[in-house]
Protein backbone atom coordinates (compact mmCIF):
# COMPACT_ATOMS: atom_id res chain seq x y z
CA UNK A 1 0.00 0.00 0.00
CA UNK A 2 1.42 3.37 -1.02
CA UNK A 3 0.41 6.79 0.32
CA UNK A 4 -1.18 9.51 -1.80
CA UNK A 5 -2.01 13.15 -1.08
CA UNK A 6 -5.70 14.10 -0.99
CA UNK A 7 -6.87 17.74 -0.78
CA UNK A 8 -10.30 19.05 0.19
CA UNK A 9 -11.61 22.41 1.51
CA UNK A 10 -11.27 22.92 5.25
CA UNK A 11 -14.78 24.23 5.85
CA UNK A 12 -18.07 24.48 3.96
CA UNK A 13 -21.54 25.70 4.95
CA UNK A 14 -24.37 23.60 3.54
CA UNK A 15 -27.19 25.33 1.69
CA UNK A 16 -30.46 26.07 3.45
CA UNK A 17 -31.84 23.00 1.68
CA UNK A 18 -29.29 20.77 3.39
CA UNK A 19 -26.99 20.25 0.41
CA UNK A 20 -23.21 20.46 0.61
CA UNK A 21 -20.81 20.06 -2.30
CA UNK A 22 -17.04 19.97 -2.25
CA UNK A 23 -14.15 18.84 -4.43
CA UNK A 24 -11.85 16.05 -3.36
CA UNK A 25 -8.60 16.17 -5.34
CA UNK A 26 -5.97 13.47 -5.31
CA UNK A 27 -2.39 13.52 -6.57
CA UNK A 28 -2.38 10.42 -8.74
CA UNK A 29 1.13 9.05 -9.06
CA UNK A 30 0.18 6.87 -12.03
CA UNK A 31 -2.53 6.18 -14.57
CA UNK A 32 -5.28 4.60 -12.48
CA UNK A 33 -8.25 3.18 -14.33
CA UNK A 34 -10.33 2.14 -11.34
CA UNK A 35 -10.82 4.47 -8.39
CA UNK A 36 -12.81 4.09 -5.18
CA UNK A 37 -13.99 7.14 -3.26
CA UNK A 38 -15.37 6.88 0.26
CA UNK A 39 -16.80 9.69 2.39
CA UNK A 40 -16.36 9.21 6.13
CA UNK A 41 -17.94 11.34 8.85
CA UNK A 42 -16.08 11.99 12.07
CA UNK A 43 -18.06 13.36 14.99
CA UNK A 44 -17.17 13.08 18.67
CA UNK A 45 -14.32 10.63 17.87
CA UNK A 46 -16.71 8.27 16.07
CA UNK A 47 -16.06 7.58 12.39
CA UNK A 48 -18.86 6.30 10.16
CA UNK A 49 -19.05 5.66 6.44
CA UNK A 50 -21.44 8.06 4.70
CA UNK A 51 -21.17 6.69 1.17
CA UNK A 52 -18.79 5.07 -1.26
CA UNK A 53 -18.48 4.63 -5.03
CA UNK A 54 -16.10 2.86 -7.37
CA UNK A 55 -15.70 4.28 -10.85
CA UNK A 56 -13.69 3.73 -13.98
CA UNK A 57 -11.74 6.79 -15.12
CA UNK A 58 -13.81 8.78 -17.59
CA UNK A 59 -17.08 7.33 -16.30
CA UNK A 60 -19.60 8.72 -13.81
CA UNK A 61 -19.49 7.84 -10.14
CA UNK A 62 -22.19 5.38 -9.22
CA UNK A 63 -23.42 5.41 -5.63
CA UNK A 64 -26.05 3.03 -4.31
CA UNK A 65 -29.64 4.03 -5.13
CA UNK A 66 -30.43 4.98 -1.53
CA UNK A 67 -27.18 6.93 -1.05
CA UNK A 68 -27.28 10.56 0.11
CA UNK A 69 -24.24 11.22 -2.09
CA UNK A 70 -23.87 12.00 -5.76
CA UNK A 71 -20.71 12.87 -7.61
CA UNK A 72 -18.88 13.55 -10.84
CA UNK A 73 -15.24 13.04 -11.73
CA UNK A 74 -12.87 15.01 -13.88
CA UNK A 75 -9.27 13.90 -14.07
CA UNK A 76 -7.93 13.69 -10.54
CA UNK A 77 -10.86 15.59 -9.04
CA UNK A 78 -14.09 14.24 -7.63
CA UNK A 79 -16.94 16.67 -7.07
CA UNK A 80 -19.02 15.26 -4.21
CA UNK A 81 -22.51 16.37 -3.21
CA UNK A 82 -24.15 15.26 0.02
CA UNK A 83 -27.90 15.83 0.31
CA UNK A 84 -30.53 15.65 2.99
CA UNK A 85 -28.30 17.12 5.67
CA UNK A 86 -29.69 18.45 8.93
CA UNK A 87 -28.06 20.40 11.78
CA UNK A 88 -27.37 17.16 13.63
CA UNK A 89 -25.23 16.05 10.65
CA UNK A 90 -22.72 18.86 11.24
CA UNK A 91 -19.28 17.29 11.42
CA UNK A 92 -16.01 16.51 9.72
CA UNK A 93 -16.41 14.77 6.35
CA UNK A 94 -13.27 12.97 5.24
CA UNK A 95 -12.53 12.00 1.68
CA UNK A 96 -10.75 8.67 1.23
CA UNK A 97 -9.44 7.77 -2.22
CA UNK A 98 -8.14 4.36 -3.30
CA UNK A 99 -6.50 3.64 -6.64
CA UNK A 100 -7.67 0.08 -7.12
CA UNK A 101 -6.32 -0.82 -10.55
CA UNK A 102 -3.80 -1.28 -12.01
CA UNK A 103 -1.33 -2.12 -9.24
CA UNK A 104 0.27 -0.82 -7.11
CA UNK A 105 -2.61 0.02 -4.76
CA UNK A 106 -2.56 3.63 -3.51
CA UNK A 107 -4.48 5.04 -0.54
CA UNK A 108 -5.05 8.69 0.31
CA UNK A 109 -7.08 10.26 3.11
CA UNK A 110 -7.84 13.99 3.23
CA UNK A 111 -7.78 16.17 6.34
CA UNK A 112 -11.54 16.48 6.13
CA UNK A 113 -14.06 19.19 5.35
CA UNK A 114 -15.95 20.58 8.32
CA UNK A 115 -19.54 20.82 7.07
CA UNK A 116 -21.87 23.05 9.06
CA UNK A 117 -25.58 22.57 8.56
CA UNK A 118 -28.41 24.84 9.70
CA UNK A 119 -31.95 23.57 9.91
CA UNK A 120 -34.19 25.94 7.93
CA UNK A 121 -36.54 28.15 9.91
CA UNK A 122 -40.05 26.65 9.87
CA UNK A 123 -42.35 28.58 7.56
CA UNK A 124 -45.05 30.49 9.45
CA UNK A 125 -48.52 29.06 8.94
CA UNK A 126 -50.47 31.09 6.40
CA UNK A 127 -54.25 31.33 6.21
CA UNK A 128 -55.82 31.18 2.80
Amino acid sequence: CKAMHVAQPAVVLASSRGIASFVCEYASPGKATEVRVTVLRQADSQVTEVCAATYMMGNELTFLDDSICTGTSSGNQVNLTIQGLRAMDTGLYICKVELMYPPPYYLGIGNGTQIYVIDPEPCPDSDF
Epitope: Q8, P9, A10, V11, V12, L13, A14, S15, S16, S21, F22, A43, D44, S45, A87, T90, L92, N111, G112, T113, Q114, Y116, I118
Partner: antibody
Framework: QVQLVQSGAEVKKPGASVKVSCKAS????????ISWVRQAPGQGLEWMGW????????NYAQNLQGRVTMTTDTSTSTAYMELRSLRSDDTAVFYC?????????????WGQGTMVTVSS | EIVMTQSPATLSLSPGERATLSCRAS???????LSWYQQKPGQAPRLLIY???TRATGIPARFSGSGSGTDFTLTISSLQPEDFAVYYC?????????FGPGTKVDIK
Protein backbone atom coordinates in the same frame (compact mmCIF):
# COMPACT_ATOMS: atom_id res chain seq x y z
CA GLN B 1 2.50 35.30 5.38
CA VAL B 2 -1.13 34.57 6.16
CA GLN B 3 -2.98 37.78 6.98
CA LEU B 4 -6.30 39.62 6.87
CA VAL B 5 -6.24 43.36 6.22
CA GLN B 6 -9.37 45.42 6.88
CA SER B 7 -10.59 48.75 5.55
CA GLY B 8 -10.25 51.94 7.57
CA ALA B 9 -12.37 53.54 10.27
CA GLU B 10 -15.81 54.91 9.39
CA VAL B 11 -18.15 57.49 10.92
CA LYS B 12 -21.81 57.05 10.01
CA LYS B 13 -25.12 58.69 10.86
CA PRO B 14 -27.99 56.67 12.38
CA GLY B 15 -30.00 54.94 9.66
CA ALA B 16 -27.06 54.76 7.28
CA SER B 17 -25.16 51.64 6.14
CA VAL B 18 -21.52 50.66 6.42
CA LYS B 19 -19.53 48.16 4.36
CA VAL B 20 -16.28 46.83 5.78
CA SER B 21 -13.78 44.91 3.66
CA CYS B 22 -11.31 42.22 4.68
CA LYS B 23 -8.59 41.24 2.20
CA ALA B 24 -6.98 37.84 2.68
CA SER B 25 -3.52 36.83 1.55
CA UNK B 26 -1.07 33.98 2.02
CA UNK B 27 -3.55 31.10 1.81
CA UNK B 28 -6.18 29.50 -0.43
CA UNK B 29 -9.10 31.83 0.25
CA UNK B 30 -11.86 29.43 -0.80
CA UNK B 31 -10.70 26.62 1.50
CA UNK B 32 -11.71 28.50 4.65
CA UNK B 33 -14.53 30.55 6.10
CA ILE B 34 -14.58 34.18 7.19
CA SER B 35 -16.34 35.07 10.43
CA TRP B 36 -17.21 38.58 11.53
CA VAL B 37 -17.01 39.56 15.19
CA ARG B 38 -17.76 42.92 16.75
CA GLN B 39 -16.79 44.52 20.02
CA ALA B 40 -18.61 47.53 21.44
CA PRO B 41 -16.47 49.90 23.55
CA GLY B 42 -15.54 48.20 26.84
CA GLN B 43 -17.55 45.07 25.98
CA GLY B 44 -16.82 41.49 25.03
CA LEU B 45 -16.70 39.77 21.65
CA GLU B 46 -19.97 39.25 19.76
CA TRP B 47 -20.10 36.79 16.86
CA MET B 48 -22.03 38.30 13.94
CA GLY B 49 -22.03 35.48 11.43
CA TRP B 50 -19.85 33.83 8.83
CA UNK B 51 -19.51 33.15 5.14
CA UNK B 52 -18.22 29.99 3.53
CA UNK B 53 -15.75 31.36 0.96
CA UNK B 54 -15.98 28.01 -0.83
CA UNK B 55 -19.60 28.46 -1.90
CA UNK B 56 -20.75 31.87 -0.63
CA UNK B 57 -23.31 30.42 1.78
CA UNK B 58 -23.91 32.53 4.88
CA ASN B 59 -25.14 32.17 8.43
CA TYR B 60 -25.97 35.21 10.56
CA ALA B 61 -26.53 35.77 14.25
CA GLN B 62 -30.26 35.88 15.00
CA ASN B 63 -30.21 39.43 16.36
CA LEU B 64 -28.67 40.79 13.14
CA GLN B 65 -30.78 38.86 10.65
CA GLY B 66 -32.17 41.22 8.02
CA ARG B 67 -29.65 43.99 8.76
CA VAL B 68 -26.38 42.27 7.84
CA THR B 69 -25.06 40.88 4.58
CA MET B 70 -21.77 39.06 4.16
CA THR B 71 -20.25 38.50 0.73
CA THR B 72 -16.95 37.47 -0.84
CA ASP B 73 -15.11 38.30 -4.03
CA THR B 74 -12.99 35.22 -4.71
CA SER B 75 -11.14 36.95 -7.57
CA THR B 76 -9.58 39.37 -5.07
CA SER B 77 -9.74 37.12 -1.97
CA THR B 78 -11.80 39.75 -0.19
CA ALA B 79 -14.71 39.38 2.22
CA TYR B 80 -17.24 42.11 2.90
CA MET B 81 -19.66 42.79 5.73
CA GLU B 82 -22.45 45.31 5.26
CA LEU B 83 -24.56 46.46 8.20
CA ARG B 84 -27.66 48.52 7.46
CA SER B 85 -30.01 50.77 9.45
CA LEU B 86 -27.21 51.69 11.82
CA ARG B 87 -28.00 52.70 15.38
CA SER B 88 -25.79 54.30 17.99
CA ASP B 89 -25.41 50.96 19.76
CA ASP B 90 -23.78 49.55 16.60
CA THR B 91 -20.71 51.64 17.43
CA ALA B 92 -17.98 49.03 17.71
CA VAL B 93 -14.75 47.62 16.37
CA PHE B 94 -15.54 45.06 13.68
CA TYR B 95 -13.13 42.18 13.13
CA CYS B 96 -12.93 39.59 10.40
CA UNK B 97 -11.35 36.26 11.32
CA UNK B 98 -10.47 33.13 9.39
CA UNK B 99 -12.48 30.06 10.33
CA UNK B 100 -10.20 27.07 9.91
CA UNK B 101 -12.71 24.24 10.00
CA UNK B 102 -10.92 20.90 9.68
CA UNK B 103 -7.46 22.29 10.40
CA UNK B 104 -7.97 23.49 13.96
CA UNK B 105 -11.65 24.42 14.45
CA UNK B 106 -10.87 27.97 15.50
CA UNK B 107 -10.48 31.58 14.38
CA UNK B 108 -6.75 31.43 13.81
CA UNK B 109 -6.06 34.68 11.95
CA TRP B 110 -7.72 38.03 12.73
CA GLY B 111 -7.88 41.31 10.88
CA GLN B 112 -6.65 44.43 12.67
CA GLY B 113 -10.21 45.66 13.25
CA THR B 114 -12.29 48.49 11.78
CA MET B 115 -13.75 51.10 14.10
CA VAL B 116 -17.28 52.12 13.10
CA THR B 117 -18.75 55.09 14.95
CA VAL B 118 -22.46 55.79 14.62
CA SER B 119 -23.29 59.30 15.70
CA SER B 120 -25.69 62.04 14.70
CA GLU C 1 -27.68 28.17 21.13
CA ILE C 2 -24.75 27.06 23.28
CA VAL C 3 -24.19 29.66 26.01
CA MET C 4 -20.62 30.00 27.25
CA THR C 5 -19.98 31.34 30.76
CA GLN C 6 -16.59 32.24 32.24
CA SER C 7 -15.39 32.63 35.78
CA PRO C 8 -14.16 34.59 37.50
CA ALA C 9 -15.01 37.83 35.68
CA THR C 10 -11.78 39.34 37.01
CA LEU C 11 -8.67 37.65 38.38
CA SER C 12 -6.17 39.81 40.26
CA LEU C 13 -2.77 38.18 40.50
CA SER C 14 0.91 39.06 40.71
CA PRO C 15 3.57 38.21 38.12
CA GLY C 16 4.90 34.70 38.68
CA GLU C 17 1.60 33.42 40.09
CA ARG C 18 -0.52 30.68 38.51
CA ALA C 19 -3.79 31.68 36.82
CA THR C 20 -6.70 29.28 36.41
CA LEU C 21 -9.56 30.43 34.21
CA SER C 22 -12.80 28.49 33.87
CA CYS C 23 -15.19 28.19 30.94
CA ARG C 24 -18.51 26.34 31.05
CA ALA C 25 -20.81 25.47 28.14
CA SER C 26 -24.59 25.18 28.54
CA UNK C 27 -24.46 21.87 26.67
CA UNK C 28 -21.73 19.39 25.82
CA UNK C 29 -19.13 20.59 23.31
CA UNK C 30 -16.69 18.24 21.60
CA UNK C 31 -13.26 19.32 22.83
CA UNK C 32 -12.04 19.64 19.21
CA UNK C 33 -14.23 22.72 18.89
CA LEU C 34 -13.25 24.69 22.00
CA SER C 35 -10.78 27.57 21.69
CA TRP C 36 -9.23 30.23 23.91
CA TYR C 37 -8.24 33.75 22.83
CA GLN C 38 -6.20 36.51 24.44
CA GLN C 39 -6.98 40.17 23.86
CA LYS C 40 -4.93 43.15 24.96
CA PRO C 41 -6.28 46.74 24.92
CA GLY C 42 -6.41 48.20 21.43
CA GLN C 43 -5.49 44.91 19.78
CA ALA C 44 -7.32 42.18 17.91
CA PRO C 45 -7.87 38.89 19.75
CA ARG C 46 -5.17 36.24 19.32
CA LEU C 47 -5.71 32.49 19.21
CA LEU C 48 -4.01 30.80 22.16
CA ILE C 49 -5.48 27.30 22.38
CA TYR C 50 -7.58 25.23 20.00
CA UNK C 51 -9.04 21.77 20.38
CA UNK C 52 -9.31 22.55 24.13
CA UNK C 53 -5.63 21.72 24.73
CA THR C 54 -3.45 22.39 21.67
CA ARG C 55 -1.32 25.53 21.74
CA ALA C 56 -1.48 27.67 18.61
CA THR C 57 1.74 28.48 16.74
CA GLY C 58 4.10 30.65 18.75
CA ILE C 59 2.21 30.38 22.04
CA PRO C 60 4.53 29.82 25.04
CA ALA C 61 4.39 26.55 26.99
CA ARG C 62 3.18 28.34 30.15
CA PHE C 63 -0.29 28.39 28.54
CA SER C 64 -2.21 25.13 28.73
CA GLY C 65 -5.80 24.09 28.21
CA SER C 66 -7.80 21.14 29.47
CA GLY C 67 -11.33 19.89 29.91
CA SER C 68 -14.11 18.12 28.08
CA GLY C 69 -17.89 18.07 27.83
CA THR C 70 -19.12 21.25 29.45
CA ASP C 71 -16.14 22.26 31.61
CA PHE C 72 -12.91 23.68 30.25
CA THR C 73 -9.90 25.36 31.87
CA LEU C 74 -7.12 27.65 30.70
CA THR C 75 -4.05 27.66 32.94
CA ILE C 76 -1.15 30.11 32.85
CA SER C 77 1.53 28.43 34.95
CA SER C 78 3.57 31.53 35.81
CA LEU C 79 2.16 34.92 34.83
CA GLN C 80 4.45 37.19 32.85
CA PRO C 81 3.87 40.96 32.61
CA GLU C 82 2.64 40.54 29.00
CA ASP C 83 -0.04 38.03 30.07
CA PHE C 84 -2.25 40.60 31.78
CA ALA C 85 -5.17 40.78 29.35
CA VAL C 86 -8.72 39.55 28.75
CA TYR C 87 -9.24 35.88 27.88
CA TYR C 88 -12.23 34.50 25.97
CA CYS C 89 -13.36 30.95 25.36
CA UNK C 90 -15.35 30.14 22.23
CA UNK C 91 -17.10 27.18 20.66
CA UNK C 92 -17.62 26.37 17.00
CA UNK C 93 -19.18 22.99 17.61
CA UNK C 94 -22.65 24.22 16.70
CA UNK C 95 -24.10 27.24 14.96
CA UNK C 96 -24.38 29.94 16.10
CA UNK C 97 -20.75 30.13 17.25
CA UNK C 98 -20.54 31.71 20.69
CA PHE C 99 -17.97 33.43 22.91
CA GLY C 100 -17.82 33.55 26.66
CA PRO C 101 -18.04 37.01 28.30
CA GLY C 102 -14.32 36.98 29.09
CA THR C 103 -12.08 36.88 32.14
CA LYS C 104 -9.87 39.89 32.82
CA VAL C 105 -6.51 39.04 34.37
CA ASP C 106 -5.10 42.14 35.99
CA ILE C 107 -2.14 43.00 38.19
CA LYS C 108 -2.74 42.75 41.93
Amino acid sequence: QVQLVQSGAEVKKPGASVKVSCKASGYTFTSYGISWVRQAPGQGLEWMGWISAYNGNTNYAQNLQGRVTMTTDTSTSTAYMELRSLRSDDTAVFYCARLTGATSHAFDIWGQGTMVTVSS
Amino acid sequence: EIVMTQSPATLSLSPGERATLSCRASQSVSSSYLSWYQQKPGQAPRLLIYGASTRATGIPARFSGSGSGTDFTLTISSLQPEDFAVYYCQQDYNLPFTFGPGTKVDIK
